[in-house]
């Protein structure tokens, strides 16, 4: 029997400061170019070396960005979301949703190293 793939969803507030290499990431998504089916949210597509996001280390490719400086990113056109980030200023607060994949074993399976109880 195959294991079931579950997801652990967590949220985090990440405060970044634009350095010489900027925040240093790219986004996908928006009402006009959905990245995830039936979800017009904004996602991190790429993190650039030496940018503030990479140096901070918490933001990951695939993370969903829920808000920027308290401004909700729901129902935005892609370019409007890009513009919101670009106009967000020097100190930027991101509310981020991480989606971590959790592999569960088959029901009733006991691993070799498990105690017999």
């Amino acid at each position: 029997m195959n294991g079931r793939v579950d997801y652990l969803v967590t949220e985090e507030e990440i405060n970044l400061t634009r350095g010489p290499s900027g925040l240093g990431f790219n986004i996908v998504g928006g009402t006009d170019q959905q990245y995830v089916s039936n979800d017009s949210g904004i996602y991190v597509s790429r993190i650039k070396e030496n940018g503030a996001a990479a140096l901070d280390g918490r933001l990951q490719e695939g993370d969903k960005i829920l808000s920027v400086n308290g401004q909700d990113l729901k129902n935005l056109l892609h370019q409007d979301a890009v513009d919101l980030f670009r106009n967000a200023g020097y100190a930027v607060s991101l509310r981020v949703q991480h989606r971590l994949q959790v592999q569960n074993g088959p029901i009733g399976h006991r691993g070799e190293g498990d105690p017999s109880g």
């Epitope: 900027g22 790219n26 650039k48």
Partner: nanobody, 125 residues
């Protein structure tokens, strides 16, 4: 790896015009935002113009707004900088740069660009 080659620089009198071109190779041109920067001797690199991947969005600093126009032809893998009403203070080496589309940083952040050309000299007398 993207290669960028600028051309079109030269010597021009004040009030004259030049059109710079930058041809890209080695990547999917239409996936990149493109920018022009310049650097005069002894001065810092300065943002001049930028255009997004589709050509639908442009940006200029106040120093060139109304005089310079950036455009692109994705079929020719080329970005252009039309410079009118040139002034002596426009004298500099002009560099073309590219960065992956939909970056979250303003265009004037030179450190966000991935690839740079070798530059073309513009001298306004």
């Amino acid at each position: 790896e993207v290669q960028l080659v600028e051309s079109g620089g030269g010597l021009v009198q004040a009030g004259g015009s030049l059109r710079l071109s930058c041809v890209a190779s080695g990547g999917t041109f239409s996936s990149y935002d493109m920018g022009w920067f310049r650097q005069a001797p002894g001065k810092e690199r300065e943002f001049v113009a930028a255009i997004n991947w589709s050509g639908g969005s442009t940006d200029y600093p106040d120093s060139v707004k109304g005089r310079f126009t950036i455009s692109r032809d994705n079929a020719k893998n080329t970005v252009y900088l039309q410079m009118n009403g040139l002034k002596p203070e426009d004298t500099a080496v002009y560099y073309c740069a590219s960065r992956w589309r939909s970056g979250v940083d303003p265009y004037y952040y030179a450190g966000t660009y991935d690839y740079w050309g070798q530059g073309t000299q513009v001298t306004v007398s």
